[in-house]
Amino acid sequence: ELRKVAHLTGKSNSRSMPLEWEDTYGIVLLSGVKYKKGGLVINETGLYFVYSKVYFRGQSCNNLPLSHKVYMRNSKYPQDLVMMEGKMMSYCTTGQMWARSSYLGAVFNLTSADHLYVNVSELSLVNFEESQTFFGLYKL
Amino acid sequence: ELRKVAHLTGKSNSRSMPLEWEDTYGIVLLSGVKYKKGGLVINETGLYFVYSKVYFRGQSCNNLPLSHKVYMRNSKYPQDLVMMEGKMMSYCTTGQMWARSSYLGAVFNLTSADHLYVNVSELSLVNFEESQTFFGLYKL
Amino acid sequence: ELRKVAHLTGKSNSRSMPLEWEDTYGIVLLSGVKYKKGGLVINETGLYFVYSKVYFRGQSCNNLPLSHKVYMRNSKYPQDLVMMEGKMMSYCTTGQMWARSSYLGAVFNLTSADHLYVNVSELSLVNFEESQTFFGLYKL
């Protein structure tokens, strides 16, 4: 039986939240999990290791608060459930070119039909290179 | 059958790129994977979770751009393939003692004979303590 | 047979080291592993992926050195073994509100009765939201 696994990479035509992902070209993996409108859709209940990295950068630092969230949505809960989150404030010297990453990864018990997404606070500050910004999971 | 797994730790006599790793002493693991001259060599095609952490520090901050890459080399591609990368710019206050880590981890489909390496931009700024700087993988 | 897995989240009534964790409510997982006085207790020898994230923040930056350690204690060693560690120095602009995360994750060969803990240098600077600060592992 095929391993349930996904590794999606940054897609620069993301225009709004949640982030959209490259699911076809490059170092992408998608097996036994569905990708739909920015989300990974679980089709088998179980334990999953879920991870994401986002690469933020800018030409001139103004220390806008940055956040990076992996959240879950399903029909049983009226609200999104934030599974993992990273926040950064006061992280660079005003006016300078800057760059910083946020990495998240943990184990969760996911249910068939759960949808997982990634959110960031400042879309314009995200660099979408495939090696720098990604989102993935695998079933234990 | 033995699990294919590796956890290598920092080796302070690294003098050039890619980084060299401790493969024998301390909290090192190496099973079903070969370590050869800085690289982890895959001997069974499949899905692997690959990770690395690098600890950068310095006595007096000058905000040199830092990069940390996990890359792959094999006979199918003429060029190295950067699998994961972290970059930092404008991350400390000029003149101060500073310290910062970069963590990378994700799932990849690797092929027998692929070799994986870690590169950093500023070797002199890396601290090689076994708990701080490491490189590993395991087959799912 | 049940998968050996744990995902514990931040507990704001931690008053001393090692950190204490929420092991009952929210997005917590605990199966085939025991939680005891801040520690995860291994009950089956084998390979484990161990991870932790800590979210540090403060109202007014004074660049106190921050450290985040995952360490192991057992009856065979007189001293704690630091498995993974992250350190930060000179990471924010003096006087400003700031926030930063540290993430650690790697594979270790653990033995039945090993106790795993998380330590931080500045307890008062840790935010214990369940999505921000956590500690987990799973048996490969």
Epitope: - | N13, E20, K36, K37, A113, Y117 | -
Partner: antibody, heavy 118, light 109 residues
Framework: QSLEESGGDLVKPGASLTLTCTAS?????????MCWVRQAPGKGLEWIAC???????TYYASWAKGRFTISKPSSTTVLLQITSLTAADTATYFC????????????WGPGTLVTVSS | QVLTQTASSVSAAVGGTVTINCQSS????????LSWYQQKPRQPPKLLIY???KLASGVPSRFKGSGSGTQFTLTIGDLECDDGATYYC??????????FGGGTEVVVK
């Protein structure tokens, strides 16, 4: 124990060629790499590529990537395929064994001459 | 990775000593992954020294290797006529990359 190269020839520019290295009296052992080194007439030695006999991982000189392909079809044979040959590839091609953990080209073949000329 | 043998040719009398230098553009693997070879016309090279200073089997102790990191030396003492040949250094680097020096001809007078 010996190595012997074969397949050297006089070929025209743009042609392709496959060189063979055959081990006699032993088979490639664990922990060793099989390599190809060349030497242009009156010039020095130039490393081309190696193959790890444990897992067939291949290692190339940066200039050799793309046009040269090393492979191991059996436990006693290593091949070197060369494409788009030019006059600059004219050389004696040696195969040699080295320890995988350090450079020590212990056993060498006598070499095979490749001449590229129109 | 570039290995430079500064002298293309050196000469000495029978019974004398010659020193050949080899400089690497970057540190070799483990600071000692360097070997030395002797090559005579129309013959393949012969291994003399590996891991900077270890003598290959069957090689006389008149051949001595030293050095670490980026600077290495081959010293041949008690020169014999038969030592007339070209000598090459070879370095091993991380990522299993190898390089040869340009060679130094030893002329025994």
């Amino acid at each position: 124990q010996s190595l012997e190269e074969s397949g050297g020839d006089l070929v025209k520019p743009g042609a392709s060629l496959t060189l063979t290295c055959t081990a006699s009296g032993f088979s490639f052992s664990s922990g060793y790499d099989m390599c190809w080194v060349r030497q242009a007439p009156g010039k020095g030695l130039e490393w081309i590529a190696c193959i790890d006999t444990d897992n067939d991982a291949t290692y190339y000189a940066s200039w050799a990537k793309g046009r040269f392909t090393i492979s191991k079809p059996s436990s006693t044979t290593v091949l070197l395929q060369i494409t788009s040959l030019t006059a600059a590839d004219t050389a004696t091609y040696f195969c040699a064994t080295t320890h995988g953990d350090y450079v020590a080209f212990k056993l060498w073949g006598p070499g095979t001459l490749v001449t590229v000329s129109s | 990775q570039v290995l430079t043998q500064t002298a293309s040719s050196v000469s000495a009398a029978v019974g004398g000593t010659v020193t050949i230098n080899c400089q690497s553009s970057q540190s070799v693997y483990k600071n000692n992954d360097l070997s030395w070879y002797q090559q005579k016309p129309r013959q393949p090279p012969k291994l003399l020294i590996y891991q900077a200073s270890k003598l290959a089997s069957g090689v006389p102790s008149r051949f001595k290797g030293s050095g670490s990191g980026t600077q290495f030396t081959l010293t041949i003492g008690d020169l014999e006529c038969d030592d007339g040949a070209t000598y090459y250094c070879a370095g091993g680097y991380t990522a299993s990359i190898y390089a040869f020096g340009g060679g130094t001809e030893v002329v025994v007078k």
